[in-house]
């Protein structure tokens, strides 16, 4: 089976059940339902999944049975629309049920909430978790899928199956260990952090497809796969891009069974043809399916062929450039992107796409000119500033990170971004700036050749978080402009923003800067978030405050927290010293 199976199936649900097996089928239907109805209780979803599974089994037994010929969207949509509390829980989303397919599914997709109003997941004691795991392993693992899926409605479903497999393995191993907590907690922390990163990466892929279209996603995929598989032929890369686009289009569109099935087919194809693709795939291809697919997605770049010729000859110096471009524009531009990307694993994907866009714009202009060759002869010179801009930015920011460390680097970014877009909500600014700040520890340790792809492509993922959160409640025209004008220029757009001079400072509210003894029991991370929240609020009150003023206030604040957390009567200390701190801060900032 290729990724594009053209063989008709009488029953799509039976086909997918047989391809995926009962366990994966049930898990994927649960993920799909939880990503659509994010507020529904776990038990309700399990009931719906069991009903769908029983129905699928009847179709496997007899594909001609009643309703077995219906599309998966029809079957799943009908099932979701049986939820009794749909109107009360979801409001206008209930109106989706009055629509016919495919409009009904589109309606459900539009109501996916990137920031659902759900309680933070609190991790129980290790013994409590191990007891729950042993008492009912199946329910325990389903609960994991449900809780992640409803909080991350665009999580890459087949990859979530891989996370669940690792989650199960962690409990299986650690609940038997002498020191359960020492074994389990680091593994759960790692899964949580990797899961958040995976969710954010997939969110960018879905945004790329949904907001900028298939061509934008395909261009991204050509660049990335050409860097990863520089020995592969252009047609091989093109085939992988076409198949990968289909997989991600399906997952982003809620077609999770098709997506998982096609992803498995793609992994199979890659492994069967690894000699033509990459020398780095051998280990991945020896793994079981879920591990194999994950491994392929993360595989390191293959070595570049030694004898690659100069690009200038055929893409700039040749008199046939316009003829070749006119013959098949997208193939010619695709080849340009492929050839440039496989030579530049040291560039970010977004930079490669900017270069391709510049090249395309130049050809569009020059091929209509009197002397096309003269016109496009210097096109590669236009690339220089585009390459130098991210290089310089990364150099400066890595120097700043090395000087400050992660926490203070995050604070510098908090101040920078709050001044750029002060209308954005404080929790969003804190979350996004903290993630932007993590670029330092993630990428600055790398040698020069790996810094840009690490940093700029990571920043694209984080800025997309800002874009999707802002889209839900738009408050800043500048954010909207940077998010919607060009996918590849989002980071340069945000970098170029200066202080928003139109912003009217927020009224001072002492309550915002009132702290209590509960801060002392928080983890270091939670305490940092409290301090960073205060910092954002300070900048919103006094956007013209200097770095020195803000540093002085934050140092005083840190000393105040440390002092009161050591006091015998903590609450009294926070009340009395807090008033003094607020007064001193107001004076220091001229509030």
């Amino acid at each position: 089976r290729g990724v594009f199976r053209r063989d008709a199936h009488k029953s799509e649900v039976a086909h997918r059940f047989k391809d995926l097996g009962e366990e994966n089928f049930k898990a994927l239907v649960l993920i799909a339902f939880a990503q659509y109805l994010q507020q529904c209780p776990f038990e309700d979803h399990v009931k719906l999944v069991n009903e769908v599974t029983e129905f699928a089994k009847t179709c496997v037994a007899d594909e001609s049975a009643e309703n077995c010929d219906k599309s998966l969207h029809t079957l799943f949509g009908d099932k979701l629309c049986t939820v009794a509390t749909l109107r009360e829980t979801y409001g206008e989303m209930a109106d989706c049920c009055a629509k016919q397919e495919p409009e009904r599914n589109e309606c459900f997709l539009q109501h996916k909430d990137d920031n659902p109003n759900l309680p933070r997941l609190v991790r129980p004691e290790v013994d409590v978790m191990c007891t729950a795991f042993h008492d009912n392993e199946e329910t325990f693992l389903k609960k994991y899928l449900y809780e992640i899926a409803r909080r991350h409605p665009y999580f890459y479903a087949p990859e979530l199956l891989f996370f669940a497999k690792r989650y199960k393995a962690a409990f299986t191993e650690c609940c038997q260990a002498a020191d359960k907590a020492a074994c389990l907690l680091p593994k759960l922390d790692e899964l949580r952090d990797e899961g958040k990163a995976s969710s954010a990466k997939q969110r960018l892929k879905c945004a790329s497809l949904q907001k900028f279209g298939e061509r934008a996603f395909k261009a991204w995929a050509v660049a990335r796969l050409s860097q990863r598989f520089p020995k592969a032929e252009f047609a091989e890369v093109s085939k992988l891009v076409t198949d990968l686009t289909k997989v991600h289009t399906e997952c982003c569109h809620g077609d999770l069974l098709e997506c998982a099935d096609d992803r498995a087919d793609l992994a199979k194809y890659i492994c069967e043809n690894q000699d033509s693709i990459s020398s780095k795939l051998k280990e991945c291809c020896e793994k079981p399916l879920l591990e194999k697919s994950h491994c392929i997605a993360e595989v390191e770049n293959d070595e570049m062929p030694a004898d690659l010729p100069s690009l200038a000859a055929d893409f700039v110096e040749s008199k046939d450039v316009c003829k070749n471009y006119a013959e098949a524009k997208d193939v010619f531009l695709g080849m340009f992107l492929y050839e440039y990307a496989r030579r530049h694993p040291d560039y970010s994907v977004v930079l490669l796409l900017r270069l391709a866009k510049t090249y395309e714009t130049t050809l569009e202009k020059c091929c209509a000119a009197a002397d096309p060759h003269e016109c496009y002869a210097k096109v590669f010179d236009e690339f220089k500033p585009l390459v130098e801009e991210p290089q310089n930015l990364i150099k400066q920011n890595c120097e700043l990170f090395e000087q400050l460390g992660e926490y203070k680097f995050q604070n510098a970014l908090l101040v920078r971004y709050t001044k750029k877009v002060p209308q954005v909500s404080t929790p969003t600014l804190v979350e996004v700036s903290r993630n932007l700040g993590k670029v330092g520890s993630k990428c600055c340790k790398h040698p020069e050749a790996k810094r840009m792809p690490c940093a700029e492509d990571y920043l694209s993922v984080v800025l997309n978080q800002l874009c999707v959160l802002h889209e839900k409640t738009p408050v800043s025209d500048r954010v909207t402009k940077c998010c919607t004008e060009s996918l590849v220029n989002r980071r340069p757009c945000f970098s170029a923003l200066e202080v928003d001079e139109t912003y009217v400072p927020k009224e001072f509210n002492a309550e915002t800067f009132t702290f209590h003894a509960d801060i002392c029991t928080l983890s270091e991370k939670e305490r940092q978030i409290k301090k960073q929240t205060a910092l954002v609020e300070l900048v919103k009150h006094k956007p013209k405050a200097t770095k020195e003023q803000l540093k002085a206030v934050m140092d005083d604040f840190a000393a105040f927290v440390e002092k009161c957390c050591k006091a015998d009567d903590k609450e009294t200390c926070f009340a009395e010293e807090g008033k003094k701190l607020v007064a001193a801060s107001q004076a220091a900032l001229g509030l």
């Epitope: 032929e233 252009f234 047609a235 033509s276 070749n324």
Partner: nanobody
Framework: EVQLLESGGGLVQPGGSLRLSCAAS????????MGWFRQAPGKEREGVSS????????FYTNSVKGRFTISRDNSKNTLYLQMNSLRPEDTAVYYC??????????????????WGQGTLVTVSS
């Protein structure tokens, strides 16, 4: 429509060299991926080497790497295959093929759209 005409085949001793040529005519953009294939008696046709006439990237099957070199002269619309250190197992009919770079894959002859008639290379002492 595209026409391809190979030349340069012949009898050569093991360790010797040959240079094959392939002249292309017609809509040359349709031939911006060009390759050499070979078919030994009783065996399937296999890819030897390919080149993009835009970009100049080259690809070789493992058994000929370091011995064969593909090149092209765009001004003459001609493809070449320089074969050195020839071995008896290189004996085959060598075909020139062309197609779209978005489709052509050296391991799959069906992805090439245009074919020459072939030229015989015999390596024997």
């Amino acid at each position: 429509e595209v026409q391809l005409l190979e030349s340069g085949g012949g009898l050569v001793q093991p360790g010797g060299s040959l240079r094959l040529s392939c002249a292309a005519s017609g809509n040359t953009y349709l031939t911006s991926c060009m390759g050499w294939f070979r078919q030994a008696p009783g065996k399937e046709r296999e890819g030897v080497s390919s080149i993009y006439t835009v970009g100049g990237s080259t690809f070789y099957t493992n058994s000929v790497k370091g011995r064969f070199t593909i090149s092209r002269d765009n001004s003459k619309n001609t493809l070449y295959l320089q074969m050195n250190s020839l071995r008896p197992e290189d004996t085959a009919v060598y075909y020139c093929a062309a197609g779209s770079p978005a489709r052509c894959r050296l391991r799959d002859p069906t992805t090439f759209d245009y074919w020459g008639q072939g030229t015989l290379v015999t390596v024997s002492s």
